[in-house]
């Protein structure tokens, strides 16, 4: 009788081990499914958002005419600011006209107030000429007011409604600019 009981007990224990194994496999399978589902949903979401997102500018960028602008919330030196903008497929702001300058300064007033923002303007060390990052010269009304007596490289920044100059190694906010997407409709 005792032998019979112990045989049954062993069989039950074996069954229990098998069930535990099955449960473990099931849990693992369920987790794998959930993970795959998550990836699948993320992929679908990205595909859908890029398909529907025909907005001319990315989220948190401001549009004006053919341009999108991003006003940074972090400080960096001029060169790092340029790097950051490039990472977003943009460049530091290049102001082409008084109208654009007015739009930028008006937007800054609404967003943040009177802070310093790097733009894509730098002074050539040899000639002393001011040039935009694409090599073009600023229009006469858009030359920085002389303020920096620095022996180091000098770069341009916007503050309130003025264009000013400073040592490129100082820390400031910055503004990135990219072309707005044209509507394909």
């Amino acid at each position: 009788k005792l032998l019979q009981v112990s045989t049954i007990a062993m069989q039950q224990q074996e069954k229990l081990i098998q069930q535990e194994r099955a449960l473990l496999n099931f849990t693992e399978w369920k987790r794998s499914c959930a993970l795959q589902m998550k990836y699948c949903q993320a992929f679908m979401q990205n595909s859908l958002s890029s398909a529907h997102n025909s907005s001319p500018c990315p989220n948190n960028w401001i549009q004006n005419r053919e341009s999108c602008y991003y006003v940074s919330e972090i400080w960096s030196i001029w060169h790092t600011s340029q790097e950051n903008c490039l990472k977003e497929g943009s460049t530091l702001l290049q102001i082409e006209s008084k109208e654009e300058m007015d739009f930028i300064t008006g937007s800054l007033r609404k967003i943040k107030g009177s802070y310093d923002y790097w733009v894509g303007l730098s002074q050539d060390g040899h000639s002393g000429r001011w040039l935009w990052q694409d090599g073009s010269s600023p229009s006469p009304g858009l030359l920085p007011a002389e303020r920096s007596q620095s022996a180091n490289q000098v770069c341009g920044y916007v503050k309130s409604n003025s264009l000013l100059s400073s040592n490129c190694s100082t820390w400031k906010y910055f503004i990135c600019e990219k072309y707005a997407l044209r509507s394909s409709v």
Epitope: I74, L86, K87, E88, G89, S90, T91, K178, Y179
Partner: nanobody, 121 residues
């Protein structure tokens, strides 16, 4: 992942010109900007020129007026032409690609192996 293959370096006479090219393969649809950096002996690596996916360009003060960067989107290739070369242009030139990210300023940088440019008579 993005793989980069550079070509076009070598020995150039002062006053001469050079054309570097860099072909990107892999996840090339995720590229936000392509460009060229250089590193002279004992100096830091510096940006020479870059071009964004939208076609905006950037030049360092050292090549403004002498350099031209262009991009063939169909071939995923970026070209850098520099004229009126000076001995100061001697450096290793590296191709760079910046990729998109869901996080602002969080994109990855990919680098080529570099191509030596020596300006000497």
């Amino acid at each position: 992942q993005v793989q980069l293959v550079e070509s076009g370096g070598g020995l150039v006479q002062p006053g001469g010109s050079l054309r570097l090219s860099c072909a990107a393969s892999g996840s090339s649809d995720s590229i936000n900007a392509m460009g060229w950096y250089r590193q002279a002996p004992g100096k830091e690596r510096e940006l020479v020129a870059a071009i964004t996916s939208g076609g905006r360009v950037v030049y360092s003060d050292s090549v403004k007026g002498r350099g031209t960067i262009s991009r063939d989107n169909a071939k995923n290739t970026v070209y850098l032409q520099i004229a009126s070369l000076k001995p100061e242009d001697t450096a290793v030139y590296y191709c760079n690609v910046k990729t998109k990210s869901a996080v602002l300023f969080g994109g990855m940088d990919y680098w080529g192996k570099g191509t030596q440019v020596t300006v000497s008579s």
